[in-house]
Interface confidence: medium
């Protein structure tokens, strides 16, 4: 039954990957992994998202051998680097290979780091917001999603993606405006429930 639930989840992920595409899947993965591994750096989460997307693409295309290999490689990487990913992985990483991946996929959220700085400093107040956004849009939005998600394990992934979309729309509009900062200064007010 655990197996049934797991394969139903996998089918749902495949359907989402097919329907919404790789970019949307990566955004979902950034949000979920950031909630699960809030102590991991953005670089680490980005790497896990890239690898996870590859695993799901292969699994969904029916390339079962590649899928199993890459899944095992990802579990191995996570366990070898658990000190910089999450303190909750110890038990999973002691399990045999076949159980390891499933256990990691279901692992509880790690504790949030203490005294995380305000998000506004980097994403609203910084003079480099439009410069950073223009340089690598998806990366900058990914970083926003990571920072927001790791601070809000209580939010649904759907809500986090909606907030990231609002932020993206605001930057698209404001970074072309005469006074970008004035334009996006109140963007976080739109996030209030």
């Amino acid at each position: 039954d655990e197996g049934k639930a797991s394969s139903a989840k996998q089918r749902l992920k495949c359907a989402s990957l097919q329907k919404f595409g790789e970019r949307a899947f990566k955004a979902w993965a950034v949000a979920r992994l950031s909630q699960r591994f809030p102590k991991a750096e953005f670089a680490e989460v980005s790497k896990l998202v890239t690898d996870l997307t590859k695993v799901h693409t292969e699994c969904c295309h029916g390339d079962l051998l590649e899928c199993a290999d890459d899944r095992a490689d990802l579990a191995k990487y996570i366990c070898e680097n658990q000190d910089s990913i999450s303190s909750k992985l110890k038990e999973c990483c002691e399990k045999p290979l076949l159980e390891k991946s499933h256990c990691i996929a279901e692992v509880e959220n790690d504790e949030m780091p203490a005294d995380l700085p305000s998000l506004a400093a980097d994403f609203v107040e910084s003079k480099d917001v439009c410069k950073n956004y223009a340089e690598a849009k998806d990366v900058f939005l990914g970083m926003f999603l990571y920072e927001y998600a790791r601070r809000h394990p209580d939010y649904s992934v759907v809500l986090l993606l909606r907030l990231a979309k609002t932020y993206e729309t605001t930057l698209e509009k404001c970074c072309a405006a005469a006074d970008p900062h004035e334009c996006y200064a109140k963007v976080f007010d739109e996030f209030k429930p």
Epitope: F42, S46, N132, A136, F140
Partner: nanobody, 125 residues
Framework: EVQLVESGGGLVQAGGSLRLSCTAS????????MGWFRQAPGKEREFVAA?????????DYADSVKGRFTISRDNAKNTVYLQMNGLKPEDTAVYVC?????????????????WGQGTQVTVSS
């Protein structure tokens, strides 16, 4: 924890060239902005060059090295390079590589989390 190991330093005559390399221990290297700093004896550590994360399509240089030094990265090899041409005696220093996942790119040392041990560059006249 990211370990950074620099190599390529040495003794060279004024006008000569050197290529420094900095290799990172992590497969997550792609998500780090990388920078080179230098410290001459009795002087403050100073910014030399930086390259942005991921594609590395944005670079920045200290005015003193613009047009002479070039920073680049090879994500497949987890390595960042500093090609130094037209070296001058005042370029003599220990060159240190640094990594940051806090910003797309930065010239500020306080925004870098990880530092190498450094490699000595000596330019004789």
């Amino acid at each position: 924890e990211v370990q950074l190991v620099e190599s390529g330093g040495g003794l060279v005559q004024a006008g000569g060239s050197l290529r420094l390399s900095c290799t990172a221990s992590r497969r997550a290297f792609i998500g780090y902005a990388m920078g080179w700093f230098r410290q001459a004896p009795g002087k403050e550590r100073e910014f030399v060059a930086a390259i942005s994360w991921f594609a590395g399509d944005t670079t920045d240089y200290a005015d003193s090295v613009k047009g002479r030094f070039t920073i680049s990265r090879d994500n497949a090899k987890n390595t960042v390079y500093l090609q130094m041409n037209g070296l001058k005696p005042e370029d003599t220093a220990v060159y240190v590589c640094a990594a940051s996942s806090a910003r797309p790119m930065s010239g500020r040392s306080d925004e870098y989390h990880y530092w190498g041990q450094g490699t000595q560059v000596t330019v004789s006249s």
